[in-house]
């Protein structure tokens, strides 16, 4: 991996072992604008392959709301408006990291966490098994 | 909001003013398996709207190593194989958290941060803009 | 309660069109497709057709070129219509509706309405 | 067409027994998002079909645990731990993955 030379203005951390704990400073920098992803865009409506946008809360997690995609269709929507089995919408999914409260309740210690979201639907061939 | 009782167990925090400082545990938990997206499925071959994963690596930023999607057509792919341009491809984008190093070159100090990634593409209807 | 309830005309004419109407309480056809299908006496059941609840549709390709759905959110009606019927069309007709949870089932019927193709 | 076959036609039991009603696809029933969308249905003399599983092993609201699915690919089965009188019908396996959506041709528990 790459070397960088430590920052002489770094805290100090006593704790130089796994489990590593770090200072993370909560107020965010933000370089985008839009954070809602129905307003982002409407491709979930456009798409060959449709999804919806189902909120999933839980306070014990930053962020709280995250939003999940679920492919409206096992098909894809053809160019007469049907649902076209010939093709497949499947979720694109993405791992991200979150911060899990830990100890539970606690609002200043976190333990990061990766999870795995869909973000959107796409079309795809499917792949076809035959029975010998 | 939710207001959830704090428990007692909680680690003390003396900066009760934003920006918040949190203790964060990088002992990560994973829900998932597998990480490689290249591995986790082949979406990105067999969509309609093919893309490229490219590596984006900035050794300052955790995760490190964050894999961008970008749309190979303008157009879809047809059932003849052809790229249509009467629909595009478009990226599906989510924002997500990451942490950065701050002070720069810190090996125990961050600051979280909100970037906007393209996780794959998908194949929308255009809007047509018709000239008066 | 979810309640589906299927009205057709119960004789047909050989070559004639059949039209049945599927009404529905209990849910919005803006949440959840309806399907159709069909059980001639003492067989089996086919599926026939479904419309989406986002009005897209997806037909059995054996029957497509006599098939048509349609929906009124508003009244909370489907309708089927099926064009120049033969006697094997003779069947029981239910709606059914599909689930809301990305099952793709079946999850509550119409008790069937009787068609009877006869001249 | 996928066709799903449901031999026997007919499985006689006697009450208190197990049964187990198999399915078998001439195609793949796993989508390209990895979920296997095969259920089943029971349809008692006289009334419209009941969903009693969906997507291969999970059990709709209502239905006693007594029912189970299991299976994967293109090989299903139905089991009821100990029959009840209430069970007795034509039993359809189906499958929502590839379209036209078909049944099977039913098998119909009866008692022994």
């Known amino acids: 991996g790459i070397t960088i030379p430590r920052n002489p203005g770094c805290p100090n951390s006593e704790d130089k072992n796994f489990p590593r704990t770090v200072m993370v400073n909560l107020n965010i920098h933000n370089r985008n604008t839009n954070t809602n992803p129905k307003r982002s865009s409407d491709y979930y409506n456009r798409s060959t392959s449709p999804w919806n946008l189902h909120r999933n809360e839980d306070p014990e997690r930053y962020p709280s709301v995250i939003w999940e995609a679920k492919c409206r269709h096992l098909g894809c929507i053809n160019a007469d408006g049907n649902v076209d089995y010939h093709m497949n919408s499947v979720p694109i999914q993405q791992e991200i990291l979150v911060l899990r409260r830990e100890p539970p309740h606690c609002p200043n210690s976190f333990r990061l966490e990766k999870i795995l979201v869909s973000v959107g639907c796409t079309c795809v061939t499917p792949i076809v098994h035959h029975v010998a | 909001g939710i207001t959830i009782p704090r428990n007692p167990g909680c680690p003390n925090s003396e900066d009760k003013n934003f920006p918040r400082t949190v203790m964060v545990n990088l002992n990560i938990h994973n829900r998932n398996t597998n990480t490689n997206p290249k591995r986790s499925s082949d979406y990105y071959n067999r969509s309609t709207s093919p893309w490229n994963l490219h590596r984006n690596e900035d050794p300052e930023r955790y995760p490190s190593v964050i894999w961008e999607a970008k749309c190979r057509h303008l157009g879809c792919i047809n059932a003849d194989g052809n790229v249509d341009y009467h629909m595009n491809s478009v990226p599906i984008q989510q924002e997500i958290l990451v942490l950065r190093r701050e002070p720069p070159h810190c090996p125990n100090s961050f600051r979280l941060e909100k970037i906007l990634v393209s996780v794959g593409c998908t194949c929308v209807t255009p809007i047509v803009h018709h000239v008066a | 309660e979810v309640k589906l309830k299927e009205s057709g005309p119960g004789l047909v004419a050989p070559s004639q069109s059949l039209s049945i109407t599927c009404t529905v309480s209990g849910f919005s056809l803006t949440s959840y497709g309806v399907h159709w299908v069909r059980q001639p006496p003492g067989k089996g059941l086919e599926w026939l057709v479904v419309?989406?609840?986002?009005?897209?549709?997806t037909y059995n390709s054996a029957l497509k070129s006599r098939l048509s759905i349609s929906k009124d959110n508003s009244k909370s009606q489907v309708f089927l219509k099926m064009n120049s019927l033969q006697t094997d069309d003779t069947a029981m007709y239910y709606c059914a509706r599909n689930d809301g949870s990305y099952y793709y089932a079946m999850d509550y019927w119409g008790q069937g309405t009787s068609v009877t193709v006869s001249s | 067409d996928i066709e799903l076959t449901q031999p026997p036609l007919s499985l006689p039991v006697s009450l208190g027994d197990q049964a187990s009603i198999s399915c078998r696809s001439s195609?793949?029933?796993?989508?390209?998002?990895?979920?296997?969308?095969l259920h089943w249905y029971l349809q008692k003399p006289g009334q419209s079909p009941k969903l009693l599983i969906y997507?291969?092993?999970n059990r709709f609201s209502g239905v006693p645990d007594r029912f189970s699915g299991s299976g994967s690919g293109t090989d299903f089965t139905l089991k009821i731990s100990r029959v009840e009188a209430e069970d007795l019908g034509v039993y359809f396996c189906?499958?929502?993955?590839?379209?036209?959506?078909?049944f099977g041709s039913g098998t119909k528990l009866e008692i022994k």
């Open positions: 189906s499958q929502s993955t590839h379209v036209p959506f078909t």
């Open positions: 997507k291969v092993s």
């Open positions: 195609q793949s029933l796993v989508h390209s998002n990895g979920n296997t969308y």
């Open positions: 419309i989406w609840s986002d009005g897209f549709t």
